[in-house]
Interface confidence: low
């Protein structure tokens, strides 16, 4: 019979190749059947008999058409910082991915080998680049006129509220505190409304901690990163 309608096993034409889902057995020198996903070759073919396939045992798999003598072992159970997004079946390996709040620090062909907790940006710092499945959060100091008062892997720096009358000027880790009603939120990050009176130094200055500031006391323009004041809260 011509090769294209032959039943396995068969000898390929000189210079020819075996068909899809077949392989060339060097020992038998014949084109033989591959085993489907979820099975493996229990008995290899001969000149007169085709491959004998058998189902994979528990906790083993084959994902592709194959002629392997044994199925592949599924990976170990997912660790506590991972979730199983694909169970181990006869046709597919277990896939472990990092749980929310974590990212894959060391990946493997499928899933993740090592998860790491996403960096938290501390007060005075906001997320400059969010974490992804395979990359960590990048934090950046809050720019002038913005703040973050949280320890978070997701919060960005937010604009200070604009006050009619400023009780305490905001800094990188604390919102401005207003004495008047109806404060407005700055639309443009970096917009800084100065309290009066104000003492301005160089462009990079820090707010001086002043827990009990008397009326008329000069404030420093709050600019640049600043770690948190103990017990401080936004307005």
């Amino acid at each position: 019979l011509p090769a294209q309608v032959a039943f396995t096993p068969y000898a390929p034409e000189p210079g020819g190749t075996c068909r899809l889902r077949e392989y060339y057995d060097q020992t038998a020198q014949m084109c033989c059947s591959k085993c489907p996903p979820g099975q493996h070759a229990k008995v290899f073919c001969t000149k007169t008999s085709d491959t004998v396939c058998d189902s994979c045992e528990d906790s083993t798999y084959t994902q592709l058409w194959n002629w392997v003598p044994e199925c592949l072992s599924c990976g170990s159970r997912c660790s506590s910082d991972q979730v199983e997004t694909q169970a181990c079946t006869r046709e597919q390996n277990r896939i472990c991915t990092c749980r929310p709040g974590w990212y894959c620090a060391l990946s493997k062909q499928e899933g993740c080998r090592l998860c790491a907790q996403l960096r938290k940006c501390r007060p005075g710092f906001g997320v400059a680049r969010p974490g992804t499945e395979t990359s960590d959060v990048v934090c950046k100091p809050c720019a002038p006129g913005t703040f973050s008062n949280t320890t978070s892997s997701t919060d960005i720096c937010r604009p200070h509220q604009i006050c009619h009358v400023v009780a305490i000027p905001g800094n990188a880790s604390m919102d401005a505190v207003c004495t008047s009603t109806s404060p407005t939120r700055s639309m443009a990050p970096g917009a800084v409304h100065l309290p009066q009176p104000v003492s301005t130094r160089s462009q990079h200055t820090q707010p001086t901690p002043a827990p009990s500031t008397a009326p008329g006391t000069s404030f420093l323009l709050p600019v640049g990163p600043s770690p948190p004041a103990e017990g401080s809260t936004g307005d």
Partner: antibody
Framework: EVQLVESGGGLVQPGGSLRLSCAAS????????MTWVRQAPGKGLEWVGI???????YYATWAKGRFTISRDNSKNTLYLQMNSLRAEDTAVYYC?????????????????WGQGTLVTVSS | DIQMTQSPSSVSASVGDRVTITCQAS??????LAWYQQKPGKAPKLLIY???KLASGVPSRFSGSGSGTDFTLTISSLQPEDFATYYC????????????FGGGTKVEIK
């Protein structure tokens, strides 16, 4: 093993320039705040400046304008460019990494430190 | 400009003594203070961070306390290897700052 190794120190004339390098191994430089600290012979520690994870640099008031901190993430190396050097800049220069304790981006304490490199400014 | 003032500048003590070094910040720095030990010809070594937390591998005879502006490093029972210079360092602000380190305290053998 986490390690920092400084290089580039040596003798330079007043008014000259020098670039110090700090090669990091065992961690990614871009994931931490990095600082430069110097120590004049027989004197205490003096902070030079710091570079954050976003690549922004901050300097001691006396270092602004003359000193520049930068880094090359591909080489995992930190740099200190020093210009208009004076005799009083003679010191051992150390690079150090922010500890990052608590998973914070910046913990405000430094460990490990490099072994230091000596810069001598003299005619 | 936050100033860090350490005292005393030097102290003579014997093995087994309790040694206390103080560090004062000119402004409130909350708990953002670290202590370092430095021996001649060597790089500084972190002892304490966030005012009272012991760094990895540091013996428990070292302890730190304080918050706000006043801080203390205590060596409960001085050992021969503890003779060195100790520095405090504020980690609160690094903008518009002259130096984040204190002047140092040399612990010498009596």
């Amino acid at each position: 093993e986490v390690q920092l190794v400084e290089s580039g120190g040596g003798l330079v004339q007043p008014g000259g320039s020098l670039r110090l390098s700090c090669a990091a191994s065992g961690f990614s430089l871009s994931d931490y705040f990095m600082t430069w600290v110097r120590q004049a012979p027989g004197k205490g520690l003096e902070w030079v400046g710091i570079i954050n994870t976003g690549g922004d640099s901050y300097y001691a008031t006396w270092a602004k304008g003359r000193f520049t901190i930068s880094r090359d993430n591909s080489k995992n190396t930190l740099y200190l460019q020093m210009n208009s050097l004076r005799a009083e800049d003679t010191a051992v220069y150390y690079c150090a990494r922010d500890t990052g304790y608590g998973g914070y981006d910046y913990a405000g304490s430094f460990d490990p430190w490099g072994q230091g490199t000596l810069v001598t400014v003299s005619s | 400009d936050i100033q860090m003032t350490q005292s005393p500048s030097s102290v003579s003590a014997s093995v087994g003594d309790r040694v206390t070094i103080t560090c004062q910040a000119s402004e409130n720095i909350n708990s953002w203070l670290a202590w370092y030990q430095q021996k001649p010809g060597k790089a500084p070594k972190l002892l304490i961070y966030e005012a009272s937390k012991l760094a990895s591998g540091v013996p428990s005879r070292f302890s730190g306390s304080g918050s706000g502006t006043d801080f203390t490093l205590t060596i409960s029972s001085l050992q021969p290897e503890d003779f060195a210079t100790y520095y405090c360092q504020q980690g609160y602000i690094y903008i518009d700052v002259g130096n984040i380190f204190g002047g140092g305290t040399k612990v010498e053998i009596k």
